[in-house]
Interface confidence: low
């Protein structure tokens, strides 16, 4: 069954997906699609990478991590209720039926009416450590749950602008990645 991720209307949603390239710059094509992963490819593609670059994306869908190091986590900007649903991250490993497919369920909740001094995410995991991430906008305090033995799609929700930070390395070091080669 799909792992569930939550965001509020107006926030950025983050759907994690990682792999480890076999060698620096030796990238594997990845596609993100709206809807569960079909047998081949992605349905309703919202973003696609090739062996070198992000070669297709649609408005509001971004890779804010370093995809050249295998961080292909999807950020959806300014979500609405219509963004709810299943998303497919497909790591297109060469060879017959070698693809790694991950279905992630995004649940969008109406925005909270009570104003808070700091914008907060809805985290489903405990958050033993706090950190500040660097993003395009003002710094925000974010939280990260402890990382037990988990598979690729069970990573706790991270900051909406993960990028190339210590946190990204923590995640990769946790083993929550697919290794290619």
């Amino acid at each position: 069954s799909e792992v569930e991720y939550r965001a509020e209307v107006g926030q950025n949603a983050y759907l994690p997906c990682f792999y480890t390239p076999a060698a620096p710059g030796n990238l594997v094509p990845v596609c993100w699609g709206k809807g569960a992963c079909p047998v081949f490819e992605c349905g309703n593609v919202v973003l696609r990478t090739d062996e070198r670059d992000v070669n297709y994306w649609t408005s509001r869908y971004w890779l804010n991590g370093d995809f050249r190091k295998g961080d292909v986590s999807l950020t959806i900007e300014n979500v609405t209720l219509a963004d709810s649903g299943i998303y497919c991250c497909r790591i297109q490993i060469p060879g017959i039926m070698n693809d790694e497919k991950f279905n992630l369920k995004l649940v969008i909740k109406p925005a909270k009416v009570t104003p808070a001094p700091t914008r907060q995410r809805d985290f489903t995991a405990a958050f033993p450590r706090m950190l500040t991430t660097r993003g395009h906008g003002p710094a925000e305090t974010q939280t990260l749950g402890s990382l037990p033995d988990i598979n690729l799609t069970q990573i706790s929700t991270l900051a909406n602008e993960l990028r190339d930070s210590r946190l990204a390395n923590d995640l990769r070091d946790s083993g929550a990645t697919i290794r290619i080669g």
Epitope: W62, D66, F67, H136, D164, S165, R166
Partner: antibody, heavy 121, light 107 residues
Framework: EVQLVESGGGLVQPGGSLRLSCAAS????????IHWVRQAPGKGLEWVAG????????EYADSVKDRFTISADTSKNTAYLQMNSLRAEDTAVYYC??????????????WGQGTLVTVSS | DIQMTQSPSSLSASVGDRVTITCRAS??????VAWYQQKPGKAPKLLIY???FLYSGVPSRFSGSRSGTDFTLTISSLQPEDFATYYC?????????FGQGTKVEIK
Amino acid sequence: EVQLVESGGGLVQPGGSLRLSCAASGFNIDRYYIHWVRQAPGKGLEWVAGITPVRGYTEYADSVKDRFTISADTSKNTAYLQMNSLRAEDTAVYYCARGYVYRMWDSYDYWGQGTLVTVSS
Amino acid sequence: DIQMTQSPSSLSASVGDRVTITCRASQDVNTAVAWYQQKPGKAPKLLIYSASFLYSGVPSRFSGSRSGTDFTLTISSLQPEDFATYYCQQHYTTPPTFGQGTKVEIK
């Protein structure tokens, strides 16, 4: 072939204005980040400003904030740097450059040939 | 702002020499460092990104490494076309900042 071509440089008096253009070909600027980086004569490189054209997000170096404005016209595949209240210390070759890894802060894989801005009375 | 202190500011070397240029960041920048080569009158060219990734088309004699906040560009065997000025750049946070440059001259 990816190309960036700057234009609009020249001699201007202190306090004057110039508008630099960066015409891109071989790629769509709305899929990348565009930056302006300058180099004073005989000096090193200094980042000036950056824009994400599709989102209109902009950032500026403190030294040019409130004087320079970066913008982009995706229909013309061109980025611009409007420079107002120019000072002698703004004299430099201005390069536009493309952000490499698909986000604002990263290395620059393609650069234009540069356009010289001279601020002098 | 993060300062990138590059050394040496210039060096003389011969063809075939191994050349090392270092850059020290004033605070943690993770692996977010790039290296560029610039020749007189020309725009910089990207050599290395994310500290150690060789940019497409760059000869393999160029390599980059990181140790904490120290970053190194190595040219394993200097070629005639490598005589130029080299710059490091941190792209970890705003504003991105460059080192002051290292001029590699013919001995």
